[in-house]
């Protein structure tokens, strides 16, 4: 996929809502300047293109949403990548000013001569993009046109602030709730001494700031912080790993707020360095329970404690996923390449049948085989519904006693689209009430994932814990399954009786040596000695003095 | 308004077969709706057989149906219909189709009157 | 596989009174939830979805709650015409389910 042909998915209807998905993966480092996309992707692409067309035919099929008033889509490829995304935008944008013009009757042909050809409708507002860098890109571009943007899973905390980011919204919470549970666990196990991995971008760069400040505030230190781009190239890997060798054995959990290609790349390294089980990584809803991340390399991910987002699994979506065919699913331009190279095989006679395959794909083949949904499913389908509940809340406003579009709602007004959609409040697909703050922001909820060897050769994501609303609750059983196992994150030990810390020059306040206080001095707190005053002594515990009783010596007593 | 009519319910011999009809007025089957066949014997409980998709043709049955029932659409003629092998007498019952709508999941908004099909020697 | 327990099979309520009807499903169903009303001889009509929503022209009286596994219905003001059967339904999901309906709820009215 070349930036020369852009593949668009469409479904017609009266309004057009854009969406931008990472279809294929970003390009890789040599393939930037053309701006050509990676592989296809299957839940963080394809599974989120299939909730955008069949959410909305749920919504179109609602006789109580948006009466008369039929949605439809343009859906875009991010390839998780801005300037990839912010080229897509352009075309939504572009399709709105051909619209508007053609409204005020500007549009003519070449020659001259006036068109008779209906443009495409205008975007009224954009689903995503995933990416909090990308995502950021976008709102730049669509805050200057009016058009709201409502995010699925760019949780950056930059994006809260509404003087820059005015037509932004989210169906997820800020990273600033994440860093902090990431930072309660850390204390709950009292690893006072760890090091610290971002990916490069929006997303790593805020989240580990936060991360940071919350450490330096409840007394624990990074040995180090590293950063390193997700799609940065084995070299760079194995040298962000042999630093944290460097830091070995002190510093061996790695709290990582990352992109689950960041995690990936980090695990590789360590299968091609030798480093299994060396480090316990902490990582951030990037990594959440994603097989993708881990899929050859669970040796190396044993143990790892990440964040997840707190969203079931949406049954309904699965019912109609599962079903999904090549020959029958035509108006998902990628699906064909997508089934490919699910099932490495050609789809003989098909259009996009690709030749690089040998094997020829037989008709047994489903969906169901190995199927994990997008574990943030329930978000994305969220954040669709909130467009629709925005847009029906807008229309019962403009239209009263008027089922469908009026003239009061054409063309359709982004501030007060944007006005209605800060005021939405609905059932999500959880179950939950969905609704938007000050800043266009979703509460959060996180489950507390643990990556496991549950029989041989056998790995998974287990449940060990939540963090609500500030409350961390863990299953320290399942964790370690029993206290000795709890693995060791400090710097320094705590001193003995009688010592104190003494921090060198330029280290970390969690690293220190100890020494021993002279025979006359105390521990007067933990960097200090002082002496005793004169006809005092230290006490037995060395944690003051006390005086020394008075001998008074008589001629008969003997030698002392 | 929108409409769903059963027909095809009959007396039938066990081991017979039977096609049952739905058809539906008031709305389109290209549009996308989940339309669904209930049974209810006498005196019992509702249960549910089986669903199509009526944009794709995806069908979904319970899981007891063992392949004796078979759900199929027609967008052009608006129907759906259910077609029953190997009737035994617990097959009777009136059998009922309904339309699932929108956000709530499958919910069952609209309903036939019902056909009763009696399985009996 | 989705299990759809209905308590009590049958209760016997006061004209005026208020009845209350429980609903358990076998796993979370994320208040995808529906309860229908039926008369004898009549089909099912739908009376509350997504678990607390009213369907159009139903009455405030009736009212749905619940979350994860556990849902109610509760009747209000029992008036003789709420004399029916009342069944709760899941809408989750159609995949590997046996029945996606509760067994049933008989409500008299004194």
């Known amino acids: 996929q070349s930036s020369e042909r852009r593949v668009v998915a469409h479904m017609p209807g009266d309004i057009i809502i854009g969406a931008l998905f990472s279809v294929h993966h970003q390009p890789t480092v040599d393939k930037v300047h053309e701006r050509k996309c990676g592989a296809v992707r299957e839940q963080y692409g394809i599974q989120r293109v299939e909730a955008m067309l069949h959410t909305l035919e749920r919504i179109n099929s609602d006789p109580t949403l948006l009466p008369n008033i039929t949605l439809g889509c343009e859906i875009r490829d991010s390839c998780w990548h801005s300037a990839v995304a912010l080229e897509q935008s352009i075309e939504f944008i572009r399709d709105s000013l051909i619209s508007s013009e053609e409204e005020e009757g500007l549009v003519r042909c070449v020659d001259g001569s006036s068109s008779s050809f209906r443009s495409k409708k205008p975007i009224v507002g954009v689903i995503g993009p995933g990416s909090s860098s990308v995502a950021i890109q976008v709102q730049n571009l669509l805050q200057l046109f009016n058009i709201p943007q409502i995010a699925y899973s760019a949780t950056s905390m930059d994006l809260s602030d509404k003087t820059l980011f005015k037509y932004f919204m989210r169906v997820v919470p800020s990273d600033a709730q994440q860093a902090r549970a990431m930072v309660d666990i850390v204390k709950r196990y009292n690893w006072t001494y760890v090091s610290a991995v971002h990916t490069e971008g929006n997303y790593g760069e805020s989240g580990m700031e936060a991360f940071k400040d919350m450490s330096a505030k409840e007394g624990i230190c990074i040995a180090h912080s590293y950063k390193i781009y997700s799609n940065a190239g084995e070299q760079s890997f194995d040298k962000l790993l042999k630093k944290l060798t460097s830091h070995l054995p002190k510093a061996r959990v790695v709290a990582c707020f990352c992109e689950g290609m960041t995690v990936r790349g980090l695990l590789m390294a360590m299968r091609r360095l030798g480093l299994a089980g060396e480090f316990l990584l902490l990582g951030s809803d990037g990594w959440a329970d994603r097989y993708d991340v881990t899929d050859g390399y669970q040796r190396e991910a044993v143990g790892g404690i990440t964040i997840k987002l707190q969203s079931p699994d949406v049954k309904w979506f699965d019912d109609y996923y599962l079903k999904l065919r090549p020959e029958t699913n035509h108006r998902n331009p990628w699906f064909q390449e997508f089934w490919q190279h699910r099932f490495q095989c050609r789809l003989e006679g098909f259009p996009q049948e690709n030749s690089k395959y040998n094997k020829t794909c037989n008709s047994s083949l489903t969906l169901k085989t190995h199927h994990v949904q997008d574990s943030k499913m329930g978000f994305v389908i969220n954040a669709i519904y909130s467009m629709a509940y925005g847009l029906h809340n807008m229309q019962m406003s403009l239209c009263p006693g008027y089922a469908g579009l009026c003239d009061a709602m054409k063309p359709i007004d982004g501030r007060k689209l944007l006005e209605s959609l800060m005021k939405t409040n609905f059932t999500g697909v959880s179950g939950d009430t969905i609704l938007f703050d000050e800043n266009g922001d979703s509460p959060g909820r996180y489950e507390i994932m643990n990556f496991k060897e549950m029989g041989k050769d056998y790995f998974d994501y287990i449940n060990v814990g939540s963090w609500d609303n500030g409350e961390l609750k863990m299953d320290d059983d399942e964790v370690w399954s029993k206290k000795s196992n709890i693995i060791r994150s400090v710097c320094s030990e705590p001193c003995e009786k009688g010592q104190i810390k003494v921090i060198r020059k330029g280290e970390v306040s969690c690293c220190w040596t100890c020494t021993p206080c002279k025979e006359n001095e105390y521990v007067f707190d933990e960097y200090t000695c002082k002496a005793c005053q004169l006809g005092s002594w230290p006490t037995d515990d060395l944690t003051g003095c006390d005086l020394i009783p008075v001998q008074y010596l008589r001629w008969g007593d003997p030698e002392p | 308004q929108e409409q769903l009519e059963e027909s095809g319910g009959d007396l039938v011999k066990p081991e017979g077969s039977l096609t049952l009809t739905c058809t539906a007025s008031?709305?389109?089957?290209?549009?996308?709706?989940?339309m669904c066949w209930v049974r209810q014997a006498p005196g019992k409980g509702l249960e549910w057989i089986a669903c199509i998709y009526t944009s794709s043709g995806s069908t979904y049955y319970a899981n007891w149906v063992n392949g004796r029932f078979t759900i199929s659409r027609s967008t052009s003629l608006n129907t759906v219909t259910l077609q029953v092998t190997s009737l035994t007498a617990a097959d009777t019952a009136t059998y009922f189709c309904?339309?699932?709508f929108g956000v709530g999941g499958y919910s069952f908004n609209l309903w036939g009157q019902g056909t009763l099909v009696t399985v009996s020697s | 596989a989705y299990d759809m327990t209905q308590t009590p099979a049958s209760v016997e309520v006061a004209v005026g009174g208020t009845v209350t009807i429980k609903c358990q499903a076998s796993q979370s169903i994320s208040s995808y939830l529906s309860w229908y009303q039926q008369k004898p001889g009549q089909r099912p009509k739908l009376l509350i979805y997504r678990a607390s929503t009213l369907a159009s022209g139903v009455s405030s009286r009736f009212k749905g709650s619940g979350s994860g596994t556990e849902y109610s219905l509760s009747i209000s003001g029992m008036e003789c015409d709420d004399a029916a059967t009342y069944y709760c339904q899941q809408g989750t999901t159609i995949s590997d389910v046996d029945n996606v309906f509760g067994g049933g709820t008989e409500v008299v009215v004194k």
């Open positions: 309904a339309k699932s």
């Open positions: 008031g709305f389109s089957f290209s549009n996308y709706y989940y």
